[in-house]
């Protein structure tokens, strides 16, 4: 806390300029009018204030706007944004995408801080949904942003926004998140032709059900093993050997290297060894010939 002291003669700031970098903290407190600071916030970022001087400027704004800063000030915070706490940011009402971009720019190249997370949360809640422009902006600054959202939060993403998603944006998503995103992606890309559709939908397939994988197997898509390994185990298990062969195309040979890992391991256990042998890959662990397979889940459904 800076002590209240009178401003020395001749030092009263008439505008926010570089001369202020030579002011001691108490002089900044005494000689800079908060209202002047608020109207000239756009200048602050161009002036190399020390971090301790920025603390004083923040204190002045806090006193002027105890209920939270107006957007006209927020948009020009620049480096001062780094001084804000999540509690400060929760008081803000940020509606402009330009304001959001300006503040994300300050934090660019760093991990998402609690301040940024709070800012994004406030912005998205204010908009009511995660529209395409917002998603474009957020994933540009934070490729992992989408996967940081809960399935409930992802449900507010409109299908049209899915066009903004790049494969790397989904790298850290878990199956529960892909379960929410996949149907949106399917809807978003539904009017594309086979090969183009597969290129777009591929990153989302970790949320695809069995029937969609069966449909893809009829389209010569040649899914790579990395994508196959991210599929839901429960969606892969009902696929036949023939369907997996069609789904993977020339990549089917990669199954051998993955035979000990899910979902390949579990899928092998469900196939007849006869059928696995037709692949000529030496996959072992299938159901021996002559054994009868009872699908107990089907039996329960019938009774």
């Amino acid at each position: 806390e800076v002590e209240k002291t009178a401003c020395p003669s001749g030092k009263k700031a008439r505008e926010i300029d570089e001369s202020l970098i030579f002011y001691k903290k108490w002089e900044l407190e005494a000689c800079v009018d908060a209202a002047l600071l608020a109207t000239q916030m756009d200048r602050v970022n161009a002036i190399p204030f020390t971090y301790e001087q920025l603390d004083v400027l923040k204190h002045k704004l806090d006193e002027l706007y105890p209920q939270g800063y107006p957007e006209s000030v927020i948009q020009h915070l620049g480096y001062l944004f780094l001084k804000m706490s999540p509690e400060d940011i929760r008081k803000w009402n940020v509606t402009s995408l330009e304001t959001l971009k300006a503040l994300l720019e300050v934090n660019k190249g760093h991990e998402m801080s609690p301040q940024v997370a709070t800012l994004i949360d406030r912005f998205v809640k204010g908009r009511g949904q995660l529209d395409k422009d917002t998603l474009d902006t957020l994933t540009a600054f934070y490729p992992g942003y989408l996967c940081s959202l809960s399935p409930e939060e992802l449900s507010s993403v409109p299908p049209s926004s899915i066009w903004a998603v790049r494969p790397q944006d989904l790298d850290t998503c878990d199956p529960r998140q892909l379960d929410v995103l996949y149907p949106k992606a399917r809807l978003a890309f539904q009017n594309m032709n086979g090969s183009e559709y597969f290129v777009k939908i591929q990153s989302f397939l970790g949320g695809a059900p069995t029937e969609d994988l069966k449909a893809l197997s009829q389209q010569n898509v040649s899914m790579d093993l990395a994508t196959f390994m991210k599929l839901r185990t429960d969606a892969v298990l009902p696929l036949t050997v023939a369907e997996v062969q069609k789904l993977l195309g020339p990549h089917v040979e990669g199954l051998k290297a993955e035979e000990r890992h899910r979902p390949v391991r579990d899928w092998i256990l469900r196939q007849r060894q006869d059928d696995l042998d037709t692949l000529g890959l030496g996959l072992q662990g299938g159901i021996p010939n002559g054994y009868l397979v009872l699908d107990l889940s089907m039996q329960e459904a019938l009774s």
Partner: nanobody, 128 residues
């Protein structure tokens, strides 16, 4: 890397004048501030003048106010210190310094902690 080279020091009589020059070379970018510090025998470094690189705003402590004038020539990357009405107590090694990074220390452009590049110094002796 930034190199700072001072020149212009020497022996001068009380009441006389000297003009120190500081040539900056190396990385070309806009500094936050440039300063002149001095260090008398057995004492710490003290700031005698500072100037912002972009706007040319200046700062002087009371001890030299009205006697010393700092200026800069951005195109030549030079900083000057015009010293008039010199006194015996102005005798010291004078250093040129550049502040290039946003810094943490309290009142940092007013003390040496705020400056990250330094020259070797030039001796100024005021004596009759």
């Amino acid at each position: 890397e930034v190199q700072l080279v001072e020149s212009g020091g020497g022996l001068v009589q009380p009441g006389g004048s000297l003009r120190l020059s500081c040539a900056a070379s190396g990385r070309t970018f806009s500094y936050n501030a440039m300063g002149w510090f001095r260090q008398a025998p057995g004492k710490g470094r003290e700031l005698v003048a500072a100037i912002t690189w972009r706007g040319g705003y200046t700062y002087y402590p009371d001890s030299v106010e009205g006697r010393f004038t700092i200026s800069r020539d951005n195109a030549k990357r030079m900083v000057y210190l015009q010293m008039n009405s010199l006194r015996a107590e102005d005798t010291a090694v004078y250093y040129c310094a550049a502040a290039t990074a946003r810094v943490y220390a309290d009142d940092s452009y007013l003390n040496e902690s705020g400056y990250d590049y330094w020259g070797q110094g030039t001796q100024v002796t005021v004596s009759s």
